[in-house]
Interface confidence: low
């Protein structure tokens, strides 16, 4: 099977004279890997290359965000003939090589996942020495991090005409649905996505008018769990006070 489109950007200086005609540069990665926040994830990446029996120096690299230009999160180097790829970079110490680059395997393990890790990752291998060649996954593997809801902020703020309003911001993946409950509340709550923060995992709900003193509770829920936080409103002489109270419920 041969494609009609030729891409020279991913197959540079492919000069090994003993290359096998049956092999070419290619990388195999899943388009997506899913894992829960706090857990570990494996990003598989295997490759083929035309340089038969290559045992010269090599470097394995993983970068995040975009191919070729994204920031590196992991890098290791193996000396000529060595099966050991010495780690030179592991961002926050959470990335480690599972595969053996000498065996065409660059699979990576990411520890202690956070929602901020939800992005695309790209593996790359570089040969040096007698052969100078390199290849990088162009599409990469998307790491999808799931998380039960967590309310990260709940507050009461001054509103128009000496009234008060409440804001509740939660994070989670899938993005949680937010609901307010409180004294004499009708359909006053409104959940709106936040302005692009946190890779879209943040959701904010505003309660535009707090007309009664008492406890107002924000509930965030998704398929993985539920979280609640409350704010107490009490008014005297035009001032307000508030205290907060949190509950988390995880579905197992």
């Amino acid at each position: 099977f041969v494609r009609t489109k030729i891409d020279t950007t991913e197959n540079l200086l492919n000069t090994e004279v003993h290359s096998s005609p049956a092999q070419r540069w290619s990388m195999q990665v899943p388009a997506e890997v899913s894992a829960a926040a706090g857990d570990a994830a494996v990003l598989p990446c295997t490759f083929t290359h035309p340089h038969r029996h290559y045992d010269g120096p090599l470097t394995a690299i993983w970068r995040a965000g975009e191919p070729y230009a994204g920031p590196q999160v992991f890098r290791c180097a193996a000396a000529r003939g060595s099966e050991l790829c010495q780690t030179a970079l592991s961002l926050h110490g959470r990335f480690r090589l599972l595969g053996n680059p000498r065996r065409n395997d660059l699979s990576l393990r990411v520890e202690r996942l956070a929602l901020a890790d939800d992005r695309r990752y790209f593996c790359r291998v570089e040969f040096a020495g007698d052969v100078h060649d390199r290849y990088e996954s162009r599409h990469g593997v998307r790491l999808h991090v799931t998380a039960a809801p967590r309310i990260i902020n709940i507050s009461v703020l001054p509103g128009p005409a000496h009234a008060f309003r409440a804001l509740c911001t939660a994070e989670g993946e899938p993005p949680p649905a937010l609901a307010w409950s409180g004294p004499a509340l009708g359909n006053g709550s409104a959940a709106v996505p936040s302005s692009g923060q946190g890779h879209g995992h943040l959701v904010t709900a505003e309660l535009p008018a707090l007309n009664h003193d008492g406890r107002y509770t924000c509930t965030a829920a998704n398929s993985l769990g539920r979280s609640e936080a409350s704010v107490y409103l009490f008014r005297f002489h035009g001032a307000s006070g508030a205290s907060t109270h949190h509950h988390h419920h995880h579905h197992h």
Partner: antibody, heavy 122, light 106 residues
């Protein structure tokens, strides 16, 4: 040349299980993913899941979780799919296909088996 | 999941005519892929990454589109083009296919 040879047609009873095979020849089995696709008349094509024999890693369509189990035997370059708890909805042709995930900037199922027909009937 | 809707489901054309079939995605995808299937045969990869023809596909075929709308066009239909064409996305799991557009030659 590259070929994927699938096992023959199956006629099975409701509630039972069936295992079909997909033997790969003409390429390095551990370097590529093998995907499985279901085709029912009037229902188009449906991705069931795929497996990378080299790292024993699987992707699954949640719809088929508990229904389909994918395995691979690298010694015989053969991929397997087992379907259990069979009902009439499982009657279909099941294809295996080699998945070229990242070469030349694209993904594609580049070689397909001839299909295994499964008929569930009492 | 991303739902791919193909139209028309059935189209009939005479040799030499130009035909276009479309594939609409329920949410934006980066690329679209097309497969050709003839009765009694397995699907064959036909167009990859929206507009690139696989080896052996005649130049009268072309693919285009972006976002949620993609199309496959045959500039001058020939009898051998009679088949069902499926679109497919690799953007997010589960990978999904369209319901197919069946091309008949009059």
């Amino acid at each position: 040349q590259v070929q994927l040879k699938q096992s023959g047609a199956e006629l099975v009873r409701p509630g039972t299980s069936v295992q079909m095979s997909c033997k790969a020849v003409g390429y390095t089995f551990t370097n590529y993913w093998i995907g499985w696709v279901k085709q029912r008349p009037g229902h188009g094509l449906e991705w069931v899941g795929d497996i990378h024999p080299g790292i024993n890693y699987t992707n699954n369509n949640e719809k088929f979780r508990g229904k389909a189990t994918l395995t691979a035997d690298t010694s015989s370059s053969t991929a397997y799919m087992q379907l259990r708890g069979l009902t009439s909805d499982d009657s279909a042709i099941y294809y295996c296909a080699r998945v070229d995930y990242d070469y030349d900037g694209s993904y594609i199922m580049d070689y397909w088996g001839q299909g295994t027909s499964v008929t569930v009937s009492s | 999941q991303i739902v791919l809707s193909q139209s028309p489901a059935l189209l009939s054309a005479s040799p030499g005519e130009k035909v276009t079939m479309t594939c609409r995605a329920s949410s934006s995808v980066s690329y679209m892929y097309w497969y050709q299937q003839k009765p009694g045969s397995s699907p064959k990869p036909w167009i990859y990454a929206t507009s690139n023809l696989t080896s052996g596909v005649p130049a009268r075929f072309s693919g285009s589109g972006s976002g949620t709308s993609y199309s496959l066009t045959i500039s001058r239909v020939e009898a051998e083009d009679a088949a069902t064409y499926f679109c497919q996305q690799w953007n997010s799991k589960p990978w999904t296919f369209g319901g197919g557009s069946k091309l008949e030659i009059r």
